[in-house]
């Protein structure tokens, strides 16, 4: 008589997570009498997947009625597949006995589960950096299968090339994770810039997933300072202005010093926003020129976003004409009350 064979026709089957899988198995003979069992894996650690005689296998059903006379098809149907179901499934024929004796195994069918990657999460540097410096952004996505995946980086629509990507684990697994780190050189115009991490995978049907991060969270554009004076209508007053230009973020503290001594401190409030996302601000003083004696140096000192202060000084210029307007008895502070423009 012909020796019994257990035939598993498919070497591999691939399904998408959430779908059902059919694993085919037929035997070539009804003899000897005995059950068929399905296992995932081989050896002593193999896992029983289906046993007609006993056990509770809520997601596994037989394709045909295995109790039907002359049935030689022992294919099974597994519903609601998850990545954890991946593995090699063996259809095994046993000879009836006490206990049943394993007789023959099929060659195995490898079930691979296609699973979508999670939405990419992009995280930026923990501290801000200034233009011309390089910052790193990290993109992570998890839970996908198969392992093949494509990740691209863009800055304002332009593809970046300076990045490193790792997919883990290196070997076969039920699902995988990707982590990529891109290096971006900042420019002064990057307040409105955005980096995009784009992930393409077979499960996404050509519609890649994207994660974004704003460079506004990563950049600090330090201000430029300019101090100048303008005459006022009143002949014994001049306007000294500190123009703070092109800074980001908004957090700014300005201190006026008279000959090195703190005169007043202001926090930037009413700011003007530039097209590139940076800000301008100006603070000004009304200076009583008659209170001037041996020359006054006014210093505008700016502390931006908690960084060390930068300053610009201006030696007060008092014309001979202005000096003539002052009587010998004139006194009072050099600096008159001010208001920001």
């Amino acid at each position: 008589e012909e020796e019994l064979q257990v035939i598993q026709p498919e070497k591999s089957v691939s399904v998408t997570a959430g779908e059902s899988a059919t694993l085919n198995c037929t035997v070539t003979s009804l003899i000897p009498v005995g059950p068929i069992q399905w296992f995932r894996g081989a050896g002593p650690g193999r896992e029983l997947i289906y046993n007609l005689k006993e056990g509770h296998f809520p997601r596994v059903t037989t394709v045909l009625d295995p109790t039907k006379r002359n049935n030689m098809d022992f294919s099974i149907h597994i519903s609601n597949i998850t990545p954890a179901d991946a593995g090699t499934y063996y259809c095994v024929k046993f000879r009836k006995g006490s206990p049943d004796v394993e007789l023959k195994s099929g060659a195995g069918t490898e079930l691979s589960v296609r699973a979508k990657p999670s939405a990419p999460v992009v995280s930026g540097p923990t501290a801000r950096a200034t233009p011309e410096h390089t910052v790193s952004f990290t993109c992570e996505s998890h839970g996908f299968s198969p392992r093949d995946i494509t990740l691209k980086w863009f800055k304002n629509g332009n593809e970046l090339s300076d990045f490193q990507t790792n997919v883990d684990p290196a070997g076969k697994s039920v699902s995988y994770s990707i982590r990529s780190t891109a290096r971006v050189v900042l420019t002064r115009r990057d307040v409105h810039s955005q980096v995009i991490c784009e992930v393409a995978h077979v499960t996404l049907q050509g519609d890649p997933l994207r994660g974004t991060a704003n460079l506004s969270e990563a950049i600090r554009v330090p201000p430029t300072l300019e101090v100048f004076q303008r005459p006022m209508r009143a002949e014994n007053q001049v306007n000294v202005t500190c123009q703070v230009r092109k800074f980001y973020p908004q957090r700014l503290l300005l201190t006026w010093l008279e000959n090195g001594n703190v005169s007043q401190t202001e926090t930037a409030s009413t700011l003007t926003e530039n097209k590139d996302g940076t800000y301008n601000w100006r603070s000004w003083l009304l200076v009583n020129t008659c209170a001037h004696r041996d020359g006054v140096v006014l210093t505008c000192q700016v502390e931006h976003d908690g960084q060390p202060a930068v300053s610009k000084s201006h030696a007060l210029e008092v014309s001979a004409h202005q000096k003539e307007q002052c009587s010998d008895t004139t006194s009072g502070p050099v600096l008159a009350p001010t208001a920001p423009l």
Epitope: R40, G43, P44, T88, G171, S173
Partner: antibody, heavy 122, light 112 residues
Framework: QVQLQESGPGLVKPSETLSLTCTVS????????WSWIRQPPGKGLEWIGF???????FYQSSLKSRVTISLDTSKNQFSLKMTSVTAADTAVYYC????????????????WGQGTTVTVSS | DIVMTQSPLSLPVTPGEPASISCRSS???????????LDWYLQRPGQSPQLLIY???SRASGVPDRFSGSGSGTDFTLKISRVEAEDVGVFYC?????????FGQGTKVEIK
């Protein structure tokens, strides 16, 4: 091809815990058994235990109370912990891959690490 | 536990000549599926063991065809058709039918 590399301390004090890690490179953890085998000086091979990729573990009965084998698939590593060591645990410790195909038995220990010498001494 | 017994424990050999090692198991390693769960290993001096034969008679990848395995049930033999100098070391048989995996005591092969 697949390579295995053992790492861990070469000297352990009596009554302390021996910890070894085996890193799998160039291949997959899936579908194999991952074994620890030791060889005392001048003696033969003694199987300690193994772990299947699905996490199921099997141990030498005489060592079972002292041994734990674990698997970290994200790092492609598996580990051995042996508590309350004595001088009798001095040996070269090998990590190895055991193949499984189809039936209940196994198909040969086909990949071995180079071995790491562990001495138990105060 | 399945006990594996090898003989001889020491085997002086002449290069170019055949050699044979015997291994006996305390219970049958022939499983109901017809597969024999018996493996042979060679441990060269200062090296890790390497798999030579699995399933009683199948040569592992890269193993020269001068090595062959035979036998079934409880009695097994490893034959080397023509011994070469690189074959010196300790040969072990091992069973993979059930846990614990067990090995023979080893047969030390050395050049005469």
């Amino acid at each position: 091809q697949v390579q295995l590399q053992e790492s861990g301390p070469g000297l352990v004090k009596p009554s302390e815990t021996l910890s070894l890690t085996c890193t799998v490179s160039g291949g997959s953890i899936r579908d194999y058994y991952w074994s620890w085998i030791r060889q005392p000086p001048g003696k033969g091979l003694e199987w300690i235990g193994f772990i299947y990729y699905n996490g199921r573990t099997f141990y030498q009965s005489s060592l079972k109370s002292r041994v734990t084998i674990s698997l970290d698939t994200s790092k492609n590593q598996f580990s051995l912990k042996m508590t309350s060591v004595t001088a009798a645990d001095t040996a070269v410790y090998y990590c190895a891959r055991v193949r499984a195909y189809s039936g209940i038995g196994l198909d040969g220990t086909d990949v071995w690490g180079q071995g790491t010498t562990v001495t138990v001494s105060s | 536990d399945i006990v594996m017994t090898q003989s001889p424990l020491s085997l002086p050999v002449t290069p170019g000549e055949p050699a044979s090692i015997s291994c006996r198991s305390s219970q049958s390693l022939l499983y109901s599926t017809g597969y024999t769960y018996l493996d042979w290993y060679l441990q060269r001096p200062g090296q890790s063991p390497q798999l030579l034969i699995y399933g009683g008679s199948s040569r592992a990848s890269g193993v020269p065809d001068r090595f062959s395995g035979s036998g079934s049930g409880t009695d097994f033999t490893l034959k080397i058709s023509r011994v070469e100098a690189e074959d010196v070391g300790v040969f072990y048989c091992g069973q993979a039918l059930q846990t614990p995996l067990t090995f023979g005591q080893g047969t030390k092969v050395e050049i005469k």
